[in-house]
Amino acid sequence: KKKEKVKKGSECSEWTWGPCTPSSKDCGMGFREGTCGAQTQRVHCKVPCNWKKEFGADCKYKFESWGACDGSTGTKARQGTLKKARYNAQCQETIRVTKPCTSKTKSKTKAKKGKGKD
């Protein structure tokens, strides 16, 4: 969610805006809801259909291999570096994802699936 400061006299000073949610399907005209204390506001917005078709996901990352299992947490991690973002998507440049350590067979399967995210 995005925060923005709008000063209008004694009104709310900081509105928090949610994502643009299309009224039907996954793109086109829709609404964005804003909240500030007890106040709420809805504004029209538009998710361009061409962007949805082009990118599918807002943020695409290239991931390293999974690290070794951390015995203390029972998880392993890997880092992803931003590869491509939808033009208006405010993506982190790097992300870190974790997953539970599992048996070798399951790990191989999951790692293969993970490569598809590159």
Partner: antibody
Framework: QVQLVQSGAEVKKPGHSVKVSCKAS????????MNWVRQAPGQGLEWIGM????????ILNQKFKDKATLTVDISTSTAYMELSSPRSEDTAVYYC??????????WGQGTLVTVSS | EIVLTQSPATLSLSPGERATLSCRAS??????LHWYQQKPGQAPRLLIK???QSISGIPARFSGSGPGTDFTLTISSVEPEDFAVYYC?????????FGGGTKLEIK
């Protein structure tokens, strides 16, 4: 931070194509959209199009679909814009800019292209 | 394409005064509106992104409001270095478009 350095001024005769380069240094060149914008003398800003270095996906302003060609060379972190068959009305300063919705953008210094017979 | 109309075309103010620049979109563009400052012989500089989000290194006197169709760039107290041309740009749909600009000049 990203630094964008553009090629020098060009003087071309009408019909002779011109290629402007934009070399990036600093943060990852391949992660961000590269926009091209032009500004005719004394006029406002006009968007030509953009290209994503990761896969060379290009989105052009329809006005420039037969005029501009955008390319990138990942190995040298350089973006290019080629103007085919330029006319006198294509005389302008051409800018490249690297866009990230999260951090904002960085602009090249601009390249003046003069088309004159 | 989305047309952005900026007003006034020219704004004459003295240093220390408050500047209010307007940008109106021909249709709703949510908060996908950005403000640029350009000085003669220089590339544009991003001041505000997504209607009201501040940019690192830009003085706090610059602020923006939106979303929808009507957007405002406010300079709370104009400094001598602020006299320049200001452009709004939308990134809601292709082609990206710019407003015609507002020239902020010394009164």
């Amino acid at each position: 931070q990203v630094q964008l350095v553009q090629s020098g001024a060009e003087v071309k005769k009408p019909g002779h194509s011109v290629k402007v380069s934009c070399k990036a240094s600093g943060q990852s060149f391949s992660s961000y959209w590269m926009n091209w914008v032009r500004q005719a003398p004394g006029q406002g800003l006009e968007w030509i199009g953009m290209i994503h270095p990761s896969d060379s996906e290009t989105i052009l302003n329809q006005k420039f679909k037969d005029k501009a060609t955008l390319t990138v060379d990942i190995s040298t972190s350089t973006a290019y814009m080629e103007l085919s068959s330029p006319r006198s009305e294509d005389t302008a300063v051409y800018y490249c800019s690297s866009w990230s919705a999260k951090r904002g953008d960085f602009w090249g210094q601009g390249t003046l292209v003069t088309v004159s017979s | 394409e989305i047309v952005l109309t900026q007003s006034p075309a020219t704004l004459s103010l003295s240093p220390g005064e408050r500047a209010t620049l307007s940008c109106r979109a021909s249709e709703s563009i949510s908060n996908n509106l950005h403000w640029y400052q350009q000085k003669p012989g220089q590339a544009p500089r991003l001041l505000i992104k997504y209607a009201s989000q501040s940019i690192s290194g830009i003085p706090a006197r610059f602020s923006g409001s939106g979303p929808g169709t009507d957007f405002t760039l406010t300079i709370s107290s104009v400094e001598p270095e602020d006299f320049a041309v200001y452009y709004c740009q939308q990134s809601n749909s292709w082609p990206l478009t710019f407003g015609g600009g507002t020239k902020l000049e010394i009164k």
